[in-house]
């Protein structure tokens, strides 16, 4: 009767000990999950007041609408201009619109003058077609002015307040474009 | 510091398909677009596609409408998917991550795209 008893109460002690386990268990899981939620609240914290804080467009670049412009003050052949605009996350200059246009030429205007600056638009080599990057075709008023008598690649730039081709290759300025952060409110 | 990796190429019939994808790890948080480049032998690294973090993408002229350049920032992944492949579509294609202005830009190993019959 003795071993009998015995075994229970080592058996009770053993279930304490799991239950022991198991509360100190679940105060780590809690304690670890107060943490996260504490870095959680910062985290977010910190990213809306950084979002609240920050402008839509980053410094040096000019805003329009949903667009933030970067008039660029180094020269640069088309494609490396291409790759200078994505190192910021943005892409050479897309003009949708005459609107966008006239905005585009009366800041270049106040900025600099009458420059040339490459736009993301270039002559694809086999059907002649003009195209803007992302594949969609320029609006019929807004097509390069003069075709280029270039036999290598040809690629659109922006001058005055006209769309002009050259050769790929010659050295311009450059105008970037990426979307405006939405301001939090 | 950020790793790219390629993956996916290989050898197709000219009019075929492949799917390259480019995974990233590390601090990708500084990458602000991503690019897929394509070197052919005897021939400078060109860029085929890219994709900014605001999902911008954009094209080469030779590629447009055959190449989709597409991101899954769940995995950290950025695909190109290639349609109608040609011969000329041979070489080795690379990823690159571009950091910021004066920062240096990351670049994968690179994998080989063969179209011939």
């Known amino acids: 009767k003795l071993l009998q008893v015995s075994t229970i109460a080592m058996q009770q002690q053993e279930k304490l000990i799991q239950q022991e386990r198991a509360l100190l268990n679940f105060t780590e899981w809690k304690r670890s999950c107060a943490l996260q939620m504490k870095y959680c609240q910062a985290f977010m914290q910190n990213s809306l007041s950084s979002a609240h804080n920050s402008s839509p467009c980053p410094n040096n670049w000019i805003q329009n609408r949903e667009s933030c412009y970067y008039v660029s003050e180094i020269w640069s052949i088309w494609h490396t201009s291409q790759e200078n605009c994505l190192k910021e996350g943005s892409t050479l200059l897309q003009i949708e619109s005459k609107e966008e246009m006239d905005f585009i030429t009366g800041s270049l205007r106040k900025i600099k003058g009458s420059y040339d600056y490459w736009v993301g638009l270039s002559q694809d080599g086999h059907s002649g077609r003009w195209l803007w990057q992302d594949g969609s075709s320029p609006s019929p008023g807004l097509l390069p002015a003069e075709r280029s008598q270039s036999a290598n690649q040809v690629c659109g730039y922006v001058k005055s307040n006209s769309l002009l081709s050259s050769n790929c290759s010659t050295w311009k300025y450059f105008i970037c474009e990426k979307y405006a952060l939405r301001s939090s409110v | 510091q950020v790793q790219l990796q390629e993956s996916g190429g290989g050898w197709v019939q000219p009019g075929g398909s492949l799917r390259l994808s480019c995974a990233a790890t590390?601090?990708?948080?500084?990458?602000?677009?991503i690019g897929w480049y394509r070197q052919a032998p005897g021939k400078q690294r060109e860029l085929v596609a890219s994709?900014?973090?605001?999902?911008?993408?954009n094209y080469s002229t030779s590629v447009m409408g055959r190449f989709t350049i597409s991101r899954d920032d769940v995995k950290n992944t950025v695909s190109l998917q290639m349609n109608s492949l040609k011969p000329e579509d041979s070489a080795v294609y690379y990823c690159?991550?571009?950091?910021?202005?004066?920062?240096?830009?990351?670049w994968g190993q690179g994998t080989q795209v063969t179209v011939s019959s």
């Open positions: 690159k991550g571009f950091a910021g202005w004066g920062k240096e830009d990351y």
């Open positions: 590390g601090s990708i948080v500084s990458i602000n677009a």
């Open positions: 994709i900014t973090n605001q999902g911008i993408r």
